[in-house]
Amino acid sequence: PLATIPVSTTSLTSSEGSTISTPSVDISTPVTTSIVGDQCSRCKNGGFWDGLKCQCLTPYYGESCEEVVNSIDIAPPETVSAQMELTVTVTSVKFTDELKNHSSQEFREFNKTFTEQMNIVYSGIPEYVGVNITNLRLGSVVVEHDVLLRTKYTPEYKTALDNATEVVKQKITKVTTEQIMTNDNCSALMCFNTTGTQVQNITVTQYDPVEECRQKAEEYEDYFLVEYRDQKPYCISPCESGFNASKNCNHGKCQMSQNGARCLCVTTETHWYSGEDCNQGTQKSHHHHHH
């Protein structure tokens, strides 16, 4: 059953035994209570009782799944890829029907020679993985094929793959212009018809760490953001320390709420701390401010 419980927190105890005071604000939090048999577990926010403890859904944790994590695991792919659909016309081979059959001796031989030729053409492109013939048709031999590119994931992967696709275009244009038949014969490994070279389509892996971060943060999506460290993206809330966006709570504890990150200020034996960043200290005996 879905219930709305008014939460009014006035103080928390820190690990040193001091009190953390918070304004008494009524935050109406939707709470899902999971009941298993006679066990009413109070697993909130979609969490479920596994018989021993609450199993929380991202981005929640805690005994009752009532707290919000400071960072969410996002896993970019190890590598990202691009696929270019190209067509070239090979003039140094006469088309025969056997070339349509991918298990024929003719197709296998053509595939081997074409792959060898393309490996030479694209040898200077570090992202180049290989080619895959999708169709052969009459005219001398029209070769519909995919050029496969791959690179390690970095924040700039799209630029790297875009650059690689441009180099592929340049190189295939160059070879199909230079390796042409002379006196009805070819002196290269393969010869081409210059006008038969076309780039039909380019598909690049779509991975957006910001999108993944926002999706996993759910209703806290506006408060989680992506920061990079060693080219790796981290999905963090301002309560996660050590990042540019980290909130400095000084004499307090950072806590996420549905209104964003806020500081819960501590009260020590000698001071009350207040202010948005808990940086205003008031001495209990003298009542004057330290900034």
Epitope: V93, K94, E106, E109, E116, M181, N185, A188, L189, M190
Partner: nanobody
Framework: DVQLVESGGGVVQPGGSLRLSCAAS????????MAWFRQAPGKEREVVAF????????YYADSVKGRFTISHDNSKNTLYLQMNSLRAEDTAMYYC?????????????????WGQGTQVTVSS
């Protein structure tokens, strides 16, 4: 796989004749390309002639035109090179090459199947 075995090489005087043979096996079709290449010591392998076994195409290098004749016997799956008016510069190792494709290339790298070669020496 395709197997090629050459024969017919030997020593011959300038102006003489020789007939080379190349027996092919392992083809799944009766329409393919066969060629003769040669390689003299210290030189690159070069095309002599090629033929499509369906009779659609023959090619001769300029240096052998009018003196050499390439032919193919479909019933025997055998390639021949009739060499007449032999010259000292024809001395080389002669190789039979084949492709399951109908090739129009004189680049040896485009030809996947090769025989072991037969030596032709033209000397007085």
């Amino acid at each position: 796989d395709v197997q090629l075995v050459e024969s017919g090489g030997g020593v011959v005087q300038p102006g003489g004749s020789l007939r080379l043979s190349c027996a092919a096996s392992g083809y799944t079709s009766n329409r393919y390309s066969m060629a003769w290449f040669r390689q003299a010591p210290g030189k690159e392998r070069e095309v002599v002639a090629f033929i499509w076994t369906d009779g659609g195409r023959t090619y001769y290098a300029d240096s052998v035109k009018g003196r050499f004749t390439i032919s193919h016997d479909n019933s025997k799956n055998t390639l021949y090179l009739q060499m007449n008016s032999l010259r000292a510069e024809d001395t080389a190792m002669y190789y039979c090459a084949a492709s399951s494709l109908l090739l129009q290339t004189i680049n040896p790298r485009a030809w996947p199947y090769w025989g072991q070669g037969t030596q032709v020496t033209v000397s007085s």
